[in-house]
Amino acid sequence: DTHKSEVAHRFKDLGEEHFKGLVLVAFSQYLQQCPFEEHVKLVNEVTEFAKTCVADESAENCDKSLHTLFGDKLCTVATLRETYGEMADCCAKQEPERNECFLQHKDDNPNLPPLVRPEVDVMCTAFHDNEATFLKKYLYEVARRHPYFYAPELLFFAARYKAAFAECCQAADKAACLLPKLDELRDEGKASSAKQRLKCASLQKFGDRAFKAWAVARLSQKFPKAEFAEVSKLVTDLTKVHTECCHGDLLECADDRADLAKYMCENQDSISSKLKECCDKPLLEKSHCLAEVENDEMPADLPSLAADYVESKDVCKNYAEAKDVFLGMFLYEYARRHPDYSVMLLLRLAKAYEATLEKCCAAADPHECYAKVFDEFQPLVEEPQNLVKQNCELFEQLGEYKFQNALLVRYTKKVPQVSTPTLVEVSRNLGKVGAKCCKLPEAKRMPCAEDYLSVVLNRLCVLHEKTPVSEKVTKCCTESLVNRRPCFSALELDEAYVPKAFNAETFTFHADMCTLSEKEKQVKKQTALVELVKHKPKATKEQLKGVMDNFAAFVEKCCKADDKEACFAEEGPKFVAASQAALA
């Protein structure tokens, strides 16, 4: 359905509030260093222009594409060259190359200060003084730090943020009410950002076939009663939504996401019995709820898969006639029977099945060749099962902090060239899998753990792509999306790595250590641990444990001292000398 004016069409569909929010997010994700006020000005100008097009779709420039309109607006920023360097060259290009250029310059790790949370009273005053500006600032600050955040979902977070302040700024104990809500939003927001980043990486690095396969598997697990044709329709629509959001087409994305939610709610009977409570909610909440909905119950008496995919004489004929559809049906049938498998495992099984058919259907006796294909799945299934079992046992034995430390050591030995902050961030997040997944029942552990690890390892891949330092990381990140986690798991100590020279400065600590929060203290200690492993990659677990125990004791001792700084100055060098001796 073509419209004379795309901008008028989207303004009318989305409404002014969502239109302005999404344009602000789009601009903040593209120009991550621009001050808030500059973005607000640009958004207001675009909004006023959109209103003129709503009034008269034939008005000047109203027929231009959104990329043209938004790109032209971004290119009016005066300090583009000084602030963004070569990104300014994008403005010399024509669409669609200009938008592609902006997309390529999105920075996953922008050099922005961490957000500090003001006092509750200060926040409540700001909220009451100018609610609209307060909420816009939230969208801006999140979007510029998370340039791939799923925009319609960010509007939902902003609505929750607003609700938290509206409720808690009236409460008797504002802090007790507000702070847990803000913590929850922060943690959920980081998780949402990371999950969306994997979707965008999947689409951009591996193409829409990879994303569609992921979506078939996941939606088949969620909606095992739905027919394959229904799942396929949802997959096609969902792929369009995410392709648009990942491509910076946030207005189209939000509009199409709303259409998809509407469709799902109008067709609940042929999708899932679990959608009812989502469908009574307002739009943003409804879309969020549908995305997070629990798996429906599996239909009773599902027949064995072997009949259609191993025993049938038509396997090769059917495969040859429509390879992707046949594999899609296989994936759908396997996934709906296995909510206990991770999506990545299901995709590995589909890949193995495809490889077998490619080989066997060209053979003299295809059936004889592929008769045992399901037996070949067993090692693929057992590998993540064993990995989850072993790591959950380790987590239960060590607790989260020490489990993170074990992973820090493991991953630093595998890829010691990676920067210390990246290794700390990624390993800390890998370690959170324990608390997140190990408490779950057996049937939910693998999908929780492996699919979470895929999200975390994608973060490593994205950061590493910006500044590549390790061929092994590049290989694991680029060869196969579904085999990334097994690829990293299989990496051993890097024998070619030349240990980092010892630098006493890295292991020098001061009294400010004592005023840090528990989390910040952990990060300091974990940073030291990574540097230690980079210096002595062949250090044993026992040696490293000894050094870390001494470190904890040294910090505790000095933080209890009257003259803390003097203690650090005196005890620090002793700790360093003792550590060097212990690791010699």
Epitope: N318, E321, A322
Partner: nanobody
Framework: QVQLQESGGGLVQPGGSLRLSCAAS????????MVWVRQATGKGLEWVST????????RYADSVNGRFTISRDNAENTLYLLMNSLKPEDTAVYYC????????????????RGQGTQVTVSS
Amino acid sequence: QVQLQESGGGLVQPGGSLRLSCAASGFAFSTSGMVWVRQATGKGLEWVSTISDDSRIIRYADSVNGRFTISRDNAENTLYLLMNSLKPEDTAVYYCATYRAGSRIGSYEDYYRGQGTQVTVSS
């Protein structure tokens, strides 16, 4: 839109040969599996042969196996069916076909098909 145009049919004596061609356009021929099906007067569609996108996988109905050869030229967007040792029971309209999104695999009534070319085997 998808277009399939068969040619090469005709009247041939039992034991004779024909080569059918199918010119394809309007879709990604080089990544699509292709099929020959046939329909004798008063009968339903009968599957004859299938070839995969890259020609690695080829299947024939038992009734034509050893006599017919399917092939394709992806550069020319053309599908072929070489028919040797023709029998009277091979008399039918021959269609080339390709999978239509949303249809069931093997449900040839729902596939994209051309207009067909008549093959008559008679002495």
